[in-house]
Each structure stands twice: as structure tokens, then as C-alpha cells.
Amino acid sequence: RWRGEGTSAHLRDIFLGRCAEYRALLSPEQRNKNCTAIWEAFKVALDKDPCSVLPSDYDLFINLSRHSIPRDKSLFWENSHLLVNSFADNTRRFMPLSDVLYGRVADFLSWCRQKNDSGLDYQSCPTSEDCENNPVDSFWKRASIQYSKDSSGVIHVMLNGSEPTGAYPIKGFFADYEIPNLQKEKITRIEIWVMHEIGGPNVESCGEGSMKVLEKRLKDMGFQYSCINDYRPVKLLQCVDHSTHPDCALKSAAAATQRKA
């Protein structure tokens, strides 16, 4: 058995359903995406040995599903998947990878072929600990590369300052596949949001630990860099589920006046 979870039940139906639903979010210029053709291109990787799937095996899938990302709307992240999805609000505020078509169809799903058979493996799938060239990791590598290449304007990045190993994983999708593929001539600046979990530890903030490494790397690459601790719009969203926690107390005079009233 592999270390990862098996192929998601009803993979094809979920994929095609998400694709059809997403088409309505696309601009008139791009809404004629052929979901069946996109699925067939994705399925190519499901016909291969689960440890022999390369990022390039998803090239046709990406070419068929790729669409434009509005300027200033890209939102990269590490260790904050659910928060990013909630904040992006189905492309309304931002368009993270999970909110572009090629990311949406696979978000939170798992897939692989059986090791010595042609069927899908619903029991387990390989992770990077089992083998590097597994179907899921290779998919997200290829998708991340494309997402970076197609991002423009102000680039936003949400990192988790409560993550025990640090806010910026030195080895991660953002570090290894996204930063190297940012197109410098299309980018005005990079804005980092270091978010801390409500009531969670403050492991790192802007300018500390791994964040210093990230800042140096981006500046060395010639990017204009800024960093915000607990970006307020996101913090307010976090506080929806922790309204009585001290971290969520409204501190402004106006808010105090409203409470008295």
C-alpha cells in the first residue's frame, strides 16, 4: 500500500461537474471550454504507472483548460489552503490556483492507477515519500508553474505564521515551482500576508526567520516586496468563527461606541 489516500470516489463525475460549473465564471471569450476533452487529457496520467507520471504529462490538459487570470487577482499560499479558498470566495475577491479551472477540477482530490493493473486504485496512492513522479504531485507542479506564468500585476501571497516549521517553507510548491516561474516583466510588486491562527502560536511574522529568507530571495530577483502581518480583511474572516476570542475584539473607538449603543 502507498502512503497517500486512494483515488477519490466518483472522480470523473466530480471533475466534469466542477468543470461545467466553473465555465459560468469564465468571461464570454473563454467559456467554450470542452470539459469532456479536458477530462480525456487529464486521464492520460491515469493510464500510466503511478510512479512514472511527469508534470509534462499534463501539458495537453493545461493547454485545454488554461485561461486568463485577472491582473492583481493572483493569490499564492502555503499552509493556508482552506483560509485562502474561503477568502477568495469563488473568484469574487481573488483567484488562487484552486479558483482557476485547471486547479478547481482537482482541488482536494486524489487519483492514481493501480500499480500492476489498468483500473484506478481506490485504496491508496503514492505521495512524494513513495516516489517523486506520482500523479498528484506532478499535477500540482505543472499547474503551479502555469499559474505563476500567467499571473500579473500585484502578486499576493498568504502564509501561515503559526506553522511550527515557519511561515515560508524553503522546500515547497511556492518556493520550488511558483517563485521561479513568476514573469518579472508582468509583475508590479509582491505583497505577503503572514496570518496567525486565532489563539494559535505566533511562530513567525514579517521580517523574522524564514520570512527574511523569502524577502531576500524576492528582492534579489528584483521584485518590489512588502509584508503585512495579519492582513485585516483575512483576519476578520478568521474571526467569524472566533468572535469572542480576545484577538477578535474590535479595538476602534467607533466600534466601542456601537457596543455602548
Partner: antibody, heavy 115, light 107 residues
């Protein structure tokens, strides 16, 4: 209010190139595609192609591929359409229009190709 | 690419007449069809999109119907300012294409 203002009329020789500009105002330029549509004298509307707001994608009509180039300069909210290797049957009024629905149009630019 | 055909290519009508123009697509375009009005020397004006949604400031005498491959533009009571050429256009992804046009002139 949304406005698209195009450059003035051009007269060109066959084989030359023409570059038409389209300056946008009244909306966030990078949020919308810009389309180019032409109309030969007494003829119908012909879609030539479009360029997306982030300057990542362009999509050209098969008829014009290899001859047309669409670009945009977000800093001055201006889109450009360049048509090369002009022929006499390229004589037309060239319009830019804001996508995705073509609700707002420029006033048109007459390009005359004549020897 | 999707080919749009319009009929009739021209028609003569009088003020107050009910006028119907049809547009047929070579493949399914769902409800993604728009109609434009163009007067001589002017840029086209968006009348209807998504088959039946009226554009900004378009009078209610204009209406659209259909889905899939067959669509209709109806002017319930033709007014003097409605004499013009009408084009259908699909907005189901690029390449966008236009129909050849229908000229409505005075009988």
C-alpha cells in the same frame, strides 16, 4: 462613462503595415478583453481577434493569423492592432470594442489601402 | 469556428409592423447569442445578449428568443429609428463570429 477613442484615418500602400490605437477610459482597463472588428465598405462585421486584460492571451481569427498582432499598454490604457502585408481588400473601418460582451465600441478608424 | 446564418438578408417594412429576424448557428451555442443594430456611418450598438437580455437603454419593443442553434430577434412595433442593419453574434468563447446581417428598410 466608458469611452474608446481610436486613432485617425490612414492611407497605406499594398504590402505596408498599419497600426491602429484604441485609448480606453471610464473603466479598469486590465479587467476586460479588447476586441477588434472590421467592416469593409458596404459589407458586414468581421471579428478579427481579441487580447485579454492581463496581456497573457490573444485569440486571432484564423483568417488573420500571421498578419495581425494585438497588444496593449496598461500604463496608458491603450490597445493596439497592427495588420501587416496590407492588400486592397483590407480597406475597411476598423473598430475596437470592450469585451466580453461588445457593449462599448470605438468610433472606428478608416484604413484605405491603395496604390 | 461557429458559423452564423441570418434570414432574411433584407426586408422592407412599415412603421408599426412586427418584424422578426432569425439567426441559426452551425453548432450548439446554448443561450450565448447577442444582437446588434448598426446605422450607416456608426459603430454597432448592443441590443440583446444571452439571447433575451436587453442591453442598456434598449426599448422594450425589442425582444429575443431561442436556444441551442435557432434564435429570433423580434421588434414588436417598428419605429422610424429602427430602420438599420441587424447582426447576430455568438459570445460562446472566441473566435467570436457575426452573422451576415439583415437590412431593415422602409417599404
Amino acid at each position: 462613462q466608458v469611452q474608446l477613442v481610436q486613432s485617425g484615418a490612414e492611407v497605406k500602400k499594398p504590402g505596408a503595415s498599419v497600426k491602429v490605437s484604441c485609448k480606453a477610459s471610464g473603466y479598469t482597463f486590465s479587467d476586460y478583453w479588447v476586441h477588434w472588428v472590421r467592416q469593409a465598405p458596404g459589407q458586414g462585421l468581421e471579428w478579427m481577434g481579441a487580447i485579454d486584460g492581463s496581456d497573457t492571451f490573444n485569440d486571432y481569427s484564423q483568417k488573420f493569423k500571421g498578419r495581425v498582432t494585438m497588444t496593449r499598454d496598461t500604463s496608458i490604457s491603450t490597445a493596439y492592432m497592427e495588420l501587416s502585408r496590407l492588400r486592397s481588400d483590407d480597406t475597411a473601418v476598423y473598430y475596437c470594442a470592450r469585451g466580453g460582451l461588445l457593449q462599448y465600441w470605438g468610433q472606428g478608424t478608416l484604413v484605405t489601402v491603395s496604390s | 469556428e461557429i458559423v452564423l446564418t441570418q434570414s432574411p438578408s433584407s426586408l422592407s417594412a412599415s412603421v408599426g409592423d412586427r418584424v422578426t429576424i432569425t439567426c441559426r448557428a452551425s453548432e450548439n451555442i446554448y443561450s450565448y447569442l447577442a444582437w446588434y443594430q448598426q446605422k450607416p456611418g456608426k459603430a454597432p450598438k448592443l441590443l440583446i445578449y444571452n439571447t433575451k437580455t436587453l442591453g442598456e437603454g434598449v426599448p422594450s419593443r425589442f425582444s429575443g428568443s431561442g436556444s441551442g442553434t435557432d434564435f429570433t430577434l423580434t421588434i414588436s412595433s417598428l419605429q422610424p429609428e429602427d430602420f438599420a442593419t441587424y447582426y447576430c453574434q455568438h459570445h460562446y468563447g472566441t473566435p467570436f463570429t457575426f452573422g451576415p446581417g439583415t437590412k431593415v428598410d422602409i417599404k
